[in-house]
């Protein structure tokens, strides 16, 4: 959590970022939020970033105000309108590249004063991973699969019963580049497994930690997978 | 060659549901942001959604919110759109369209579009 | 929502002729301002991307103009092949808003 206030001349406001993370190809969020102002025409919300002449966004009198835009962020950016009124300068960016990862600024007006706050962005590529029975291999096998990663993660596979146990000489890990050259699918294989257990497979990246369990029992198979992103912090 | 096939309209009830699917071919599916885009009888051209390259991100018209759901299947390369509490005035004809690749919002191939009518 | 405006509703003109279609936007939209063409029967085909970027395919009859909230479409010389309807499209942000059409029809 990043809090910042203003600087000389008009009341200093508080203004509240969260450090985050986007998945390329997909819709990201960068949050900021601000003291109120009764009057939506006294707001103004600038968002920068830094190494980038033009702005990333600016709202004005009620309405986005484009002419400044930087090339790489057109069509991509929009606030949350409805609710600039009540303090939330959060920015919705369309279509993540990996190339909008960096530092920004949210930079508050109103008719009580001034403020701003950084924001870390990181961008990077996570999905859930699903564990199935691998039912063409010649042995009990597991496999995990998730289609969009990056950063390359690690892939590590653990089990209820063995807990604390080294997987990593029964399986088998493999990574193939996604059509846009940038994102990989993960592929990883677990051999041996018995019955009446729980395995995990964790795959973890420096943006995201993503775990897929199956429990596969003589009767029915279970599955459940979460995913948690890393190193949110609010400034 | 681009090419977006859309199918699934038919007549429905009000209230009732219907699927739309999209078969795309000629391009990788998996890198650009889908549309559905409707048209109804003698009328102009509505946005009605989209769908993120990794189908995690949506975003909807007021109009349809709560009520259509836009999807996609990449392994199969095919866009959805499932409508349901279908009423009167969602009566058109649905066009599946592809955004353009990183910015900008238009919409560069179009398909040739299904008609949904939605009548007692 | 940004309201996007179209005018005339139609265009009465002849093959030869130059036509001026015009699109107002309800709040500036920078350059953020994409054209189609629609014929009977058709889907809708992209002429013109952020006002005035010309697409690969579309004949160079086809220009656009404007920045901010008054745009325009020009057609120098009229083939009989563009009689039909235009639309403006707000290229803007997430909601993705067209202009109602104008009607290019022969005189």
């Known amino acids: 959590l990043i809090i910042g206030f203003g600087i000389s001349g008009r009341h200093s406001i508080t203004v509240t970022t969260v450090a985050s993370a986007g998945n390329i190809g997909e819709d990201g969020i960068l949050s900021c939020t601000f003291e109120p102002d009764i009057k939506l025409s006294d707001i103004v919300i600038q968002w920068l970033k830094e190494g980038v002449l033009g702005l990333v966004h600016e709202f004005k009198e009620g309405k986005d105000e484009l002419s400044e835009q930087d090339e790489m962020f057109r069509g991509r950016t929009a606030v949350f309108a409805d609710q600039v009124i009540v303090g939330n300068a959060s920015l919705r960016l369309k279509n993540v590249q990996l190339t909008d990862a960096g530092t920004y600024k949210c930079y508050i007006i109103t008719s009580k004063g001034k403020g701003n706050a950084n924001l870390e962005y990181k961008t990077g590529a996570f999905s859930m991973p699903e564990v199935n029975v691998d039912y063409n291999a010649s042995s009990e096998t597991l496999r995990c699969e998730a289609p969009r990663w990056f950063p390359q993660p690690t892939v590590v596979w653990a089990s209820q019963v063995d807990q604390g146990a080294n997987f990593s000489e029964v399986s088998n890990t493999s990574f193939e580049l996604n059509s846009e050259n940038v994102t990989m699918k993960v592929v990883s294989v677990l051999y041996n497994v018995t019955i009446n257990n729980t395995y995990s497979c964790m795959i973890e990246n420096d943006i995201a930690k993503a775990t897929g369990d199956i429990k596969v029992t003589e009767s029915e198979i279970k599955r459940r997978s979460h995913l948690q992103l890393l190193n949110s912090k609010a400034s | 060659e681009v090419q977006l096939v859309e199918s699934g309209g038919g007549l429905v009830q009000p209230g009732g549901s219907l699927r739309l699917s999209c078969a795309a071919s000629?391009?990788?599916?998996?890198?650009?942001?889908m549309s559905w885009v409707r048209q109804a009888p003698g009328k102009g051209l509505e946005w009605v959604a989209y769908v993120s390259s990794g189908g995690g991100s949506t975003y909807y018209s007021d109009s349809v919110k709560g009520r259509f759901t836009i999807s996609r299947d990449n392994a199969k390369n095919t866009l959805y759109l499932q409508m349901s509490s279908l009423r009167a005035e969602d009566t058109a004809v649905y066009y599946c369209?592809?955004?353009?690749?990183?910015?900008?919002?238009?919409?560069?191939?179009w398909g040739q579009g299904t008609t949904v009518t939605v009548s007692s | 929502e940004i309201v996007m405006t179209q005018s005339p509703a139609t265009l009465s003109l002849s093959p030869g002729e130059r036509a001026t279609l015009s699109c107002r936007a309800s709040?500036?939209?920078?350059?953020?301002l994409h054209w189609y063409q629609q014929k009977p029967g058709q889907s809708p085909r992209l002429l013109i991307k952020f006002a005035s970027q010309s697409i690969s395919g579309i004949p160079a009859r086809f220009s656009g103009s404007g920045s901010g909230t008054d745009f325009t479409l020009t057609i120098s010389s009229l083939e009989p092949e563009d009689f039909a309807v235009y639309y403006c499209q707000n290229g803007h942000s997430f909601s993705l808003t067209f202009g109602q059409g104008t009607k290019l029809e022969i005189k």
């Open positions: 709040q500036s939209i920078s350059d953020y």
């Open positions: 369209t592809r955004e353009s690749y990183s910015q900008g919002n238009y919409f560069d191939y």
């Open positions: 000629g391009f990788t599916f998996s890198n650009y942001y």
